[in-house]
């Protein structure tokens, strides 16, 4: 019995659902009562899901698997794995037994996009040409391990004095921290590129350093020029710093964080004490660092509604303030492609191809192209709907007249994360059904 599975690994984003395709060719008169189907982990032989004695025996794998019962009789033994985790990565074997027996293994490759890197400088004040500075590039919650590349403002690679570390959290997702030590020139731009090798996703940030003396007078409050980008559900640090004078004590400090537009109080520190969060109890200062001039705010479990500008007010004897922008983002899922009609397709038929990608933020950019990279812009309708969390589901519909054959590819881009997710469908010239049967 010939059992067919994809040669290439199935790539699935963490948290999304994956289909492990497996098919066989049923003979005339085949009935499900004859079918024994077993999915198991290739290495450990752990049972994942089975179908026997004419019945779905259910999931033996954390209740996250399902078959396609309506398609089994046509030879579709594919397995749906829900809410994919890093730990799911590996090889799954599909065993099919009717009279004869056959099996084949399919690989699941798990992936998660890296966040836009945040850049920090140490020291970050009173920088002069000739000073040695440490630039840290941090990117979060990606999988598998990233590749990190540094370059200057002219594209010259910076490979000396770079130390990169990657730590997996309890979900197996990696946080990457890459540290570059440089001696400052008159000024310079330093850029860090974090690549996800499986998603072929690049996330990059840069920092431009112009060494100079800080002005005297009012308290100089420093915040990042670029928006802080935070993934939905993660924690974000809104950086804010000031330069304490010798003899400074926290009793002198008044620190207020508020929403720039509405002036709503977010968090405060006055009279030598942290006055706590006034913002849904999701904010915190860094109390041990305040005396060194670190007035940064930690915002936990970021939501789409948090996006906007936050102002950091610092008052000691003098007064200063600066605003930092929070840009919220969520990666789009790998698009699913559907055809309508999806059976008996012939050259000359008009088909509607729908590309759907879910739970991203902000709104996506959608691009269609054919198999030669030619953009397809006519007869495209794209709609984006926000759910109650403010995350967008994008549905883009392309109407085409079929040629002899053709590949139609849809690219969904998250403009903030610089994350591209794409799907494609190839339609051959002879009469066919989608998805193709084994």
């Amino acid at each position: 019995l010939e059992v067919q599975v994809p040669e290439d690994p199935v790539v699935a984003l963490v948290g999304t659902d994956a289909t492990l395709c497996c098919s066989f060719s049923p003979e005339p008169g085949f009935s499900l009562a004859q079918l024994n189907l077993i999915w198991q982990l290739t290495d450990t032989k752990q049972l994942v899901h089975s179908f026997a004695e004419g019945q779905d025996q259910g999931s033996a794998y954390a209740n996250r698997t399902a078959l396609f019962p309506d398609l089994l009789a046509q030879g579709n033994a594919s397995l749906r794995l829900q809410r994919v985790r890093v730990a799911d990565e590996g090889s799954f074997t599909c065993f099919v037994s009717i009279r004869d027996f056959g099996s084949a293994a399919v690989s699941l490759q798990v992936a998660a996009p890296y966040s836009k890197p945040s850049m920090t400088l140490e020291p970050n004040k009173d920088l002069r040409p000739g000073d040695t500075v440490t630039i840290t590039c941090s990117s979060y919650q990606g999988y598998p391990e990233a590749e990190v590349f540094w370059q200057d403002g002219q594209g010259v690679p910076l490979t000396g004095n770079v130390t990169t570390s990657q730590m997996a959290n309890e979900q197996g997702l990696f946080d990457v921290h890459s540290i570059l030590r440089v001696v400052l020139g008159a000024n310079g731009t330093y850029s860090c590129l974090v690549r996800n090798p499986v998603l072929q996703q690049d996330a990059h940030s840069s920092v431009t350093i112009t060494p100079q003396r800080s002005p005297t007078g009012a308290v100089e409050v420093q915040v990042p020029e670029d928006p802080v980008v935070a993934l939905v559900g993660t924690d974000a640090t809104l950086r804010c710093s000031f330069s304490p004078e010798p003899g400074f004590s926290l009793a002198q400090l008044n620190l207020i964080w508020q929403l720039t537009d509405t002036k709503q109080l977010v968090h405060s520190f006055t009279e030598g004490r942290d006055q706590g969060s006034a913002y849904a109890n999701r904010t915190a200062l860094f109390p041990d660092l305040l005396a060194q001039g670190n007035a940064s705010l930690r915002l936990q479990r970021v939501r789409v509604a948090d996006e906007g500008s936050f102002t950091c007010f610092v008052s000691i004897r003098d007064f200063g303030s600066a605003a930092v922008s929070l840009q919220v983002a969520a990666p789009y899922s790998k698009p699913s492609m559907t055809l309508e009609p999806n059976k008996d397709l012939r050259p000359g038929d008009t088909v509607t191809i729908t590309c759907s990608s879910y739970r991203g933020y902000p709104e996506a950019e959608v691009f269609w192209q054919d198999g030669q990279g030619v953009p397809l812009t006519g007869n495209v309708t794209t709609s984006q709907m926000a759910n109650e969390q403010g995350l967008f589901d994008v549905h883009s519909v392309l109407r085409v007249v079929l040629g002899a054959n053709g590949t139609y590819s849809c690219l969904v881009r998250n403009p903030v994360l610089q994350q591209d997710a794409h799907g494609s469908v190839t339609i051959t010239g002879q009469p066919m059904t989608f998805p193709p049967e084994a």
Epitope: F149, Q151, G153, Q154, G155, L193, P197
Partner: antibody, heavy 121, light 106 residues
Framework: EVQLVQSGAEVKKPGSSVKVSCKAS????????IHWVRQAPGQGLEWMGY????????DYNQKFKDRVTITADKSTSTAYMELSSLRSEDTAVYYC??????????????WGQGTTVTVSS | DIQLTQSPSFLSASVGDRVTITCRAS?????MNWYQQKPGKAPKLLIY???NLASGVPSRFSGSGSGTEFTLTISSLQPEDFATYYC?????????FGQGTKLEIK
């Protein structure tokens, strides 16, 4: 129009030096690095080194490090490549090229017309 | 040094053929650029940052890849495409080119 115009062909004796110029026009000379790439007859492209005309930072391919010097004159928007201790295997076409783009993607978008250097006794 | 190895080194093809040239890097690189060179001329940029078409380059050219393996594809060869093609990286010093792939008319 962005252009790099190189000096004319040179015939040199083994052991001598050659200095090839590359004049830039149509863009801000100090905004991009200028690289030198050579190509021996019937062979592929070989990178020699670059200069940042603004900072005058240079870096060279180790293969040429002791023999090549790249300089730039901001006042005339001209880059120079000097190769010393010439030998017959240095016979090649020498190109200057602008490394262009923006963070983090860069590429050679403008090339000089090439300068043929022949080393022969 | 990161070595770039192009395959094949020589390729004979006909007008209308689909052609793929591969460039393998000895270590992972951040991206790849591709150039076309005709006899007696300077190289010309075709593809930058692995998959982006340079200005004025026909859409029959495309690039793909990641890490250590990159490809340049010409979907339907035209007479003017017969030339030598080079890949190039500068993720670490020195900047390197592939040895070239000469595309000839069959």
């Amino acid at each position: 129009e962005v252009q790099l115009v190189q000096s004319g062909a040179e015939v040199k004796k083994p052991g001598s030096s050659v200095k090839v110029s590359c004049k830039a026009s149509g863009y801000s000379f100090t905004s991009y690095t200028i690289h030198w790439v050579r190509q021996a007859p019937g062979q592929g492209l070989e990178w020699m080194g670059y200069i940042n005309p603004n900072s005058r930072n240079t870096d060279y391919n180790q293969k040429f490090k002791d023999r090549v010097t790249i300089t730039a004159d901001k006042s005339t928007s001209t880059a120079y490549m000097e190769l010393s201790s010439l030998r017959s295997e240095d016979t090649a076409v020498y190109y200057c090229a602008r490394y262009s783009g923006s963070t983090p993607y860069w590429y050679f978008d403008v090339w000089g017309q090439g300068t043929t250097v022949t080393v022969s006794s | 040094d990161i070595q770039l190895t192009q395959s094949p080194s020589f390729l004979s093809a006909s007008v209308g053929d689909r052609v793929t040239i591969t460039c393998r890097a000895s270590s992972s690189v951040s991206y790849m650029n591709w150039y076309q060179q005709k006899p007696g001329k300077a190289p010309k940029l075709l593809i930058y940052a692995t998959s982006n078409l340079a200005s004025g380059v026909p859409s029959r050219f495309s690039g793909s890849g990641s890490g250590t393996e990159f490809t340049l594809t010409i979907s339907s060869l035209q007479p003017e495409d017969f030339a030598t093609y080079y890949c190039q990286q500068w993720s670490s010093n020195p900047l390197t080119f592939g040895q070239g792939t000469k595309l000839e008319i069959k």
